[in-house]
Interface confidence: medium
């Protein structure tokens, strides 16, 4: 019942009917990848459809059988560039849409043929489960393999050289002259450094078989360990176009009973808050001593270390002891900035009983602080322009027309949810199902060109959009203007070309404006109707009199001047997209030498 404070309406009933979910496989095309490599599983490879029209339902995929030749992985930390990939047995369709699911070929075996991994999956929506879905992954066999892969044995922090006794690659179809083998470090060692001529190798970097032959590749453990530990690095070898499987190189590091043992555990602090840095988070001790002094090498960037309970906001703690950590005297205070992490590099030095004691031992490390974000910002509109559409026609609605941002850290703008009301002058529908109106969609849907506006009724109107980041709301209006279909090329298009030289004609030179539903650059065609007089139009290296919008986007169209002394040239074009056409001219200014 609705009331304005004085009067109330008669009761109305909202009927909610829960229907059983229906699941249908939309795509399960499988993957094809090289042995030893990884490939994302995208909606083009794997997607399902449900009868939950206009609802944001959770579609869960589960792996039901063991994998033989690799692993399924999911990317952590919201798909941030460089975030770690972890083995997983389950993932959501949303993860697939965000490119956060991949198959990694880990099988190091030498095969005569390509192998096929059939991922057995089941799909769950609500209580409904669709079983026996097979997703085939074809793994192109490797032809480079390891003739020798022998573990490295090293003692603590001393540098050991990797030789051909440890690593030697061979090619299945070796020719008369041996190829150059390139080793790519896929995952660097965690407990030490792999170095090429003294420079640390990280993920994606590498070395050659010649480097191994010449003794240029070394490994050294980063810290002395009190017990024997194992380290590994993962690598693959190429001799283009040939490649190897993904290999793991084992490293055995001998123990040292009197080595310092470091406890270094992430401290989690709320945005703008503080947390006690205790011995549970940071502590160094050895067999014969628990007396260590810590020096802060670099102040934290987004907060400060302070003594617990102090009111002085200006002083910073730059050194402390194990005693301070044991008694919980130290706090990290965050500065309330929109940051997700901070770090504190330190050196811990063993304190001798007398000044004549043995050389002090050092442990270097970085103490990390994770900042828990607080959603304290509302979304803000960053793009707003009139949305032009052909009368009675349709057009993609994208982030070129309306877009928002959110200042909260750890929040991807793609996650913003837009909700719209019913329209009197058209409807908003899904691109892949134009009969289905959609009322909720994400900014990612706009960016990925999944949203279509279909015009009907009045020529002018406003779409009221409610934008939410899950906590805060913002309202925005998108003005829609319908008119006869048009194509326009910006007036005064011009290009400057050196005498006898070339200039690229791209979309910045011929800027097209239209209200048509153009999905691809191949739908717009340009034909030269006059000129040029002092040069010629070149497309993909050949003289041309016609080209497409795609050619402009690709930078494939050039004006090539013939070297004459005329200071300007002109070209006229007819521009067509379906039944609509217009004329355009391009002025070319020649920069005479």
């Amino acid at each position: 019942r609705v009331s304005d404070g004085l009067q109330a309406s008669p009761p109305a009933t909202l009927k909610v009917v829960a229907i059983r979910p229906a699941i249908q496989i939309h795509r399960s095309t499988g993957l094809r990848l090289a042995q030893g490599s990884a490939m994302p599983i995208l909606p083009a490879n794997l997607s399902v459809e449900t009868n939950a029209v206009g609802q944001d339902v959770s579609v869960l995929f589960r792996v039901t059988g063991a994998l033989q030749f690799g692993e399924l992985q999911k990317q952590g930390a919201g798909g941030v560039e460089g975030a770690e990939w972890w083995a997983t047995q389950a993932f959501h369709q949303r993860d697939v849409e965000q490119g956060r699911v991949r198959y990694l070929s880990t099988d190091p075996q030498h095969h005569a043929y390509d192998t096929v991994e059939n991922l057995a999956l089941e799909v769950q929506v609500g209580q409904e489960i669709l079983s026996n879905l097979s997703f085939p992954v074809t793994i192109q066999r490797a032809t480079v393999w390891m003739l020798r892969l022998e573990p490295l044995h090293t003692q603590n922090t001393q540098q050991e050289t990797l030789t051909t006794a440890h690593l030697e690659a061979t090619l299945e179809e070796a020719g008369p002259s041996p190829p150059t083998f390139h080793y790519e470090v896929v995952q660097a060692p965690r407990k030490g450094n792999l170095q090429l001529q003294g420079t640390r190798l990280s993920d994606g970097q590498g070395f050659t078989q010649d480097d191994i032959q010449a003794g240029r590749v070394t490994y050294g453990a980063t810290a002395r360990a009190s017990e024997a530990v194992e380290d590994t690095f993962r690598f693959r070898v190429t001799a283009p176009p040939y490649f190897s499987p993904l290999y793991t190189f084992p490293i055995h590091i001998g123990g040292d009973p009197d080595a310092p043992v470091l406890t270094n555990v992430l401290l989690v602090v709320p945005e703008g808050g503080e947390g006690v840095l205790s011995a549970d988070h940071l502590f160094v001790k050895s067999l014969n001593s628990a007396s260590y002094l810590y020096e802060v090498m670099e102040r934290p960037r987004h907060g400060r270390l302070a003594w617990r309970g102090t009111q002085d906001k200006t002083t910073m703690v730059t050194s402390f002891t194990n005693e301070d950590l044991l008694r919980g005297r130290l706090v990290y205070q965050h500065d309330d900035s929109e940051t997700t992490e901070d770090d504190i590099p330190f050196v811990a030095t063993r304190q001798g009983e007398s000044s004549g004691d043995m050389a002090w031992e050092e442990v270097r490390g970085v103490f990390r602080v994770a900042i828990q974000p607080v959603n304290d910002h509302a979304p803000v509109q960053t793009i707003s322009r009139i949305f032009h559409v052909a009368r009675g026609g349709r057009r993609l609605l994208t982030t070129d027309d309306v877009a928002f941002s959110d200042a909260d850290s750890g929040f991807a703008d793609a996650q913003l949810v837009l909700t719209r009301k019913d329209l009197l002058f058209g409807s908003i529908v899904a691109v892949d199902e134009p009969t289905r109106p959609i009322y909720r969609f994400t900014q990612e849907d706009l960016r990925k060109r999944r949203v279509l506006f279909v015009h009907s009724g009045a020529d002018r109107g406003w779409i009221q959009l409610q934008v939410s980041d899950g906590q805060h709301q913002a309202t925005a209006l998108l003005e829609v203007q319908a008119s006869e279909p048009y194509l326009r090329v910006a007036n005064g298009s011009s290009l400057v070309v050196p005498q006898g030289g070339q200039g690229t004609i791209d979309t910045a030179v011929l800027h097209l404006d239209t209200n048509l539903d153009i999905r691809s650059g191949d739908e717009v065609h340009y034909h030269v109707t006059a000129g040029p007089r002092w040069g010629q139009l070149v497309r993909a290296g050949q003289p041309a009199t016609a080209f497409s919008q795609q050619d402009l986007l690709d930078g494939a169209v050039l004006y090539s001047h013939n070297g004459s002394l005329s200071p300007r040239d002109t070209m006229a074009f007819s521009v067509e997209a379906g039944p609509v056409h217009t004329d355009a001219t391009l002025q070319v200014t020649i920069a005479l030498e």
């Epitope: 095969h111 005569a112 043929y113 096929v116 393999w145 061979t170 299945e172 179809e173 008369p176």
Partner: antibody, heavy 118, light 112 residues
Framework: EVQLVESGAEVKKPGDSLKISCKGS????????IGWVRQMPGKGLEWMGI????????TYSPAFQGDVTISVDKSISTAYLQWNSLKASDTGIYYC???????????WGNGTLVTVSS | QSALTQPASVSGSPGQSITISCTGT?????????VSWYQQHPGKAPKLMIY???NRPSGVSNRFSGSKSGNTASLTISGLQAEDEADYYC???????????FGTGTQLTVLG
């Protein structure tokens, strides 16, 4: 010159054992897969299996798995095809061939005719 | 895994062009660009004529060409000559456990 030379024709009785050979020369024998192909009288080519001389990795076609053994002696650049108990239906020409890149055979042996008859 | 399907015989006059088809499935011909063609004269070993659908080894006449559409591969011989009379076999990699499959074979006759 790259070539594969196979051993001579054989006439055997059902139940006999047999080992035929294929010697490679003119190239790095251990670096290329060697496959075996059967051609029964008046019939087409049938894929039997393959071996990599570098490490003796072997793969058989399911139709021949268990009936034949493919092996290699890389010290003399020779591949072998062996039967423990021949049948009359094993009669045919057996070719060895060098496999290149993406599953094609660029060099073929001259073929060994095996006749099994009581 | 059954063999790839080829016509049993094809014929043509000298100078003409002929095409031999080789039909498989999406697990072999359609799924991979690993189709090869072999020529076999009576009493001789097969000879590689085309590999990876359309590539010609050195020494093979450019009258021989290969192509593929969907699940069917084709070998075309233009300017037919008497010495082209032979049996022709296609083959393909397959994702089935057989791994490698030959065609049923086509007998080419050069008339006259």
């Amino acid at each position: 010159e790259v070539q594969l030379v196979e051993s001579g024709a054989e006439v055997k009785k059902p139940g006999d054992s047999l080992k035929i050979s294929c010697k490679g020369s003119g190239y790095s024998f251990t670096s290329y897969w060697i496959g075996w192909v059967r051609q029964m009288p008046g019939k087409g080519l049938e894929w039997m299996g393959i071996i990599y001389p570098g490490d003796s990795e072997t793969t058989y076609s399911p139709a021949f798995q268990g009936d034949v053994t493919i092996s290699v002696d890389k010290s003399i650049s020779t591949a072998y095809l062996q039967w423990n108990s021949l049948k009359a239906s094993d009669t045919g020409i057996y070719y060895c061939a060098r496999r290149r890149g993406n599953y094609y055979m660029d060099v073929w042996g001259n073929g060994t005719l095996v006749t099994v008859s009581s | 895994q059954s063999a790839l399907t080829q016509p049993a015989s094809v014929s043509g006059s000298p100078g003409q062009s002929i095409t031999i088809s080789c039909t498989g499935t999406s697990s072999d011909v359609g799924g991979y660009n690993y189709v090869s063609w072999y020529q076999q004269h009576p009493g001789k070993a097969p000879k590689l004529m085309i590999y990876d659908v359309s590539n010609r080894p050195s020494g093979v006449s450019n009258r021989f060409s290969g192509s593929k559409s969907g699940n069917t591969a084709s070998l075309t011989i233009s300017g037919l000559q008497a010495e082209d009379e032979a049996d022709y076999y296609c083959s393909s990699y397959t994702s089935s456990s057989t791994r490698y499959v030959f065609g049923t074979g086509t007998q080419l006759t050069v008339l006259g």
